[in-house]
């Protein structure tokens, strides 16, 4: 679809003559008839297949024709066509004299031909005018012509329709050849696909307008490359969506079991030692002078038996005092009025005089102690056993009976049951005092993750296109990890054909 445009510029008929040799009376009042048709080697009468047009009277005898854009007598003349421009044409321009109406001379009787010209040739679509001048014995016509495409038509033959748009169906302008030129931020054959934010993950992200990056379920972040942990997850993170990989010190399916209660809560008071013993479990080992589950209770001042030589202890609010037996004195009944002559040393202890007979000292045999060798040695009073170990007096020595998971003379060494990797199928091992605990990955169970759960959601093979299936944290929940080029909750869509998005 296009327009053949003819610009008439100058007509000369200096003698004012008609084609039949007669003069015009009083002068040749001139109008033009134009016939445009398909190319003919020899111009013949017949319909003007490409169009025809007539002008009003433009002048008398010789005159210059000015451009006129509106009203009657428009110049250039417009011959629109609604077909593919073939590139060739035939044009017949006739100059006529009319004695009648200036504006509609075509309808007047008695019109007479002044002259005519015929042009046959080729013409390419373009904005440039082709100028020509035709002379014959009586007249001269100067003119130019061109073919341009109608609005929204493009190409060598004005056959390519392109209308610029910026809506749901496309976002583009038109190139001179009619091809689409996408507006910034859009791509695709029809410029209807937005260009997502730079770096937006091809599979995990999508957009409905330029520079957006909306994440598919299970992904987050500006580029949709960070996973979202499982809905029920408490103290865990993920490497694939909906996973719950526990932070250090947490266990269980939702990472809600506290494996390190001691560190997280510091339940043991007064400088006591805390030992973890399973999920939410712990033991406090108290320093001397304290007792209670959390060593929160202070023992009485007399509990440490500060009175020697059989003295009896009496508690006061912030202190104590010793009631000494006969022959002893001092804050702790540590001084004696006796001498070696009184045989004060028991259990075979030997007596040594001191201070010119004013006092004595007993040297005790093994397993006895006290100023008079009156006490059997209790080697456990200093709480030498760590990690809740039980202290046992064994004659001249003592031994520590360790709790499960600990060893060493003082139970100070932790036995790592996890060192021998007891958890199968990628289970996470946690050293607890009662032995190792395995947190199993989806699809496995048992104390050592040795039992494969066969009725999980992945058993039915719900993932397409070679995707890897992961069982979620509920037996009937699964996640498909798509290979490159596929998306969708089951990896059922090629990236090139995403599910349609509502715009």
């Amino acid at each position: 679809s296009g327009i053949f445009q003819l610009r008439l510029q100058e007509f000369a008929n200096e003698r004012g003559m008609l084609a039949n040799g007669r003069p015009c009376e009083p002068g040749c009042r001139t109008f033009f008839r134009i016939c445009l048709k398909h190319y003919q080697a020899t111009f013949s009468e017949g319909p003007c297949t490409f169009g025809n047009v007539s002008t009003p009277v433009l002048g008398t005898n010789s005159f210059v024709i000015r451009d006129k854009n509106s009203g009657s007598g428009r110049n250039p003349l417009q011959l629109p066509f609604n077909f593919t421009w073939p590139g060739t044409f035939s044009l017949n321009i006739q100059a006529w004299h009319t004695p009648g109406d200036d504006l509609r001379p075509e309808t007047s009787p008695g019109n007479s031909l002044i002259s005519q010209i015929i042009i046959q040739g080729s013409l390419a679509v373009g904005k440039n005018w082709k100028s020509d001048e035709q002379n014959n014995t009586l007249t001269r016509l100067r003119y130019s012509y061109r073919v341009v495409c109608s609005d929204n038509y493009y190409g060598d033959s004005c056959s390519r329709l392109c209308k610029k748009r910026d809506d749901h169906f496309g976002h583009y302008e038109c190139q001179p050849d009619g091809s689409l030129s996408c507006l910034p931020g859009w791509t695709g054959k029809y410029c209807d696909q937005p260009i997502c934010l730079s770096g937006c993950h091809e599979q995990n992200g999508y957009c409905s307008k330029p520079d957006e990056c909306n994440c598919r379920p299970g992904w987050q972040g500006p580029l949709c490359n960070e996973c979202i942990p499982h809905n029920g997850c408490r103290h865990g993170t993920c490497t694939i969506p909906w996973q719950c990989a526990c932070d250090e010190g947490w266990g269980g399916l939702f990472c809600d079991q506290d494996l390190n209660y001691c560190t997280h809560h510091s339940p043991c008071k007064n400088g006591s030692t805390c030992s973890n013993s399973g999920p939410r479990g712990y033991t406090c080992t108290c320093l001397p002078g304290y007792t209670g589950e959390h060593c929160e209770l202070e023992l009485s001042k007399c509990a440490s038996n500060p009175c020697r030589n059989g003295g009896s202890c009496k508690d006061h609010e912030n202190s104590y005092h010793c009631l000494c037996p006969p022959g002893y004195y001092g804050q702790h009944c540590e001084h004696s009025t006796l001498t070696c002559a009184d045989s004060p040393c028991f259990n075979g202890g030997s007596c040594r005089e001191r201070n010119q007979g004013a006092s004595y000292a007993c040297e005790c045999p093994p397993n006895f102690t006290g100023s008079n060798c009156e006490k059997k040695v209790d080697r456990c009073t200093s709480n030498p056993c760590a990690n809740g170990g039980q202290c046992l007096n064994r004659g001249p020595s003592r031994t520590c009976r360790c709790r499960p998971g600990f060893t060493g003379t003082h139970c100070e060494l932790h036995i790592s049951d996890c060192a021998r990797s007891p958890c199968a199928h990628g289970g996470t091992c946690h050293d607890l005092e009662n032995g190792p605990v395995c947190t199993c990955p989806a699809g496995f169970s048992g104390r050592r993750c040795e039992v494969r759960i066969t009725n999980d959601a992945c058993a039915s093979g719900p993932c397409f296109n070679g995707a890897t299936c992961y069982t979620g944290l509920s037996p009937n929940n699964f996640v498909c990890n798509c290979p490159y080029g596929f998306v969708g909750s089951r990896c059922e869509f090629p990236v090139g054909l995403p599910p349609s998005f509502p715009w």
């Epitope: 409905s208 909306n214 994440c215 598919r216 379920p217 299970g218 992904w219 987050q220 972040g221 500006p222 960070e226 979202i228 942990p229 809905n231 029920g232 997850c233 408490r234 103290h235 865990g236 993170t237 932070d247 979620g472 009937n476 929940n477 969708g488 909750s489 089951r490 599910p499 349609s500 998005f501 509502p502």
Partner: antibody
């Protein structure tokens, strides 16, 4: 136990500002995306804004873009919603919730009422 | 935005009844659907996600099903504590959208 406790609601005039806070406990806050969801009196639920766990990416519903700002402080286990240029249609109970725009909202706070009226 | 339409808007039932609430999306949402329960003056509580997965601590009398655009919440035997308003939500497309709610009342 997961707990989300909102605060900062109240009565404000049209064009005014409010800052809502949400204190989170019982889970490792820094691992999880968070959201604000609102409910106008007697009406349904409406997602307002979301922020990713890394604090890198906020998203907003169209009607609040440019007026509301969601942010978080992972060190303080806190989520915030700064609301400016408030309108009568913003009147609602605002809930703090754990979740993203593309995931379910697994845990919700008790809500805080925002009333915009002259 | 994706439109979520719940039906019915309200319904009356008795303790022990089996109740079904449906939710229709204006477009395919690929099982990315959640159901919430909300009691008067309280915050919503997640019941079901991914169309059919029960959230932690939710009684087994609640179940979900569906595919494509249509999803269903079923309560097999109503208990007194189940009378509340129920909302569906899609999270396939941005922005997330909720249904208008279904109020379940005692008959």
């Amino acid at each position: 136990e997961v707990q989300l406790v909102e605060s900062g609601g109240g009565l404000v005039q049209p064009g005014g500002s409010l800052r809502l806070s949400c204190a989170a406990s019982g889970f490792t806050f820094r691992h999880f995306p968070m959201a604000w969801v609102r409910q106008a009196p007697g009406k349904g639920l409406e997602w307002v804004a979301t922020i990713s766990s890394s604090d890198a990416w906020p998203s907003y519903r169209d009607s609040v873009k440019g007026r509301f700002t969601i942010s978080r402080d992972n060190a303080k286990n806190s989520l915030y919603l700064q609301m400016n240029s408030l309108r009568a249609e913003d009147t609602a109970v605002y809930y703090c919730a754990r979740g993203y725009y593309n995931s379910p909202f697994a845990y919700w706070g008790q809500g805080t009422l925002v009333t915009v009226s002259s | 935005d994706i439109q979520m339409t719940q039906s019915p808007s309200s319904l009356s039932a008795s303790v022990g009844d089996r109740v079904t609430i449906t939710c229709r999306a204006s477009q395919e949402i690929y099982r990315n659907l959640a159901w919430y329960q909300q009691k008067p003056g309280k915050s919503p509580k997640l019941l079901i996600f991914d169309t059919s997965v029960l959230a932690d601590g939710v009684p087994s009398r609640f179940s979900g099903s569906g595919s494509g655009t249509d999803s269903t919440l079923t309560i097999s035997s109503l208990q007194p504590e189940d009378f509340a308003t129920y909302y569906c939500q899609q999270y396939t497309y941005y922005p997330p959208t909720f249904g208008q709610g279904t109020k379940l009342e005692i008959k």
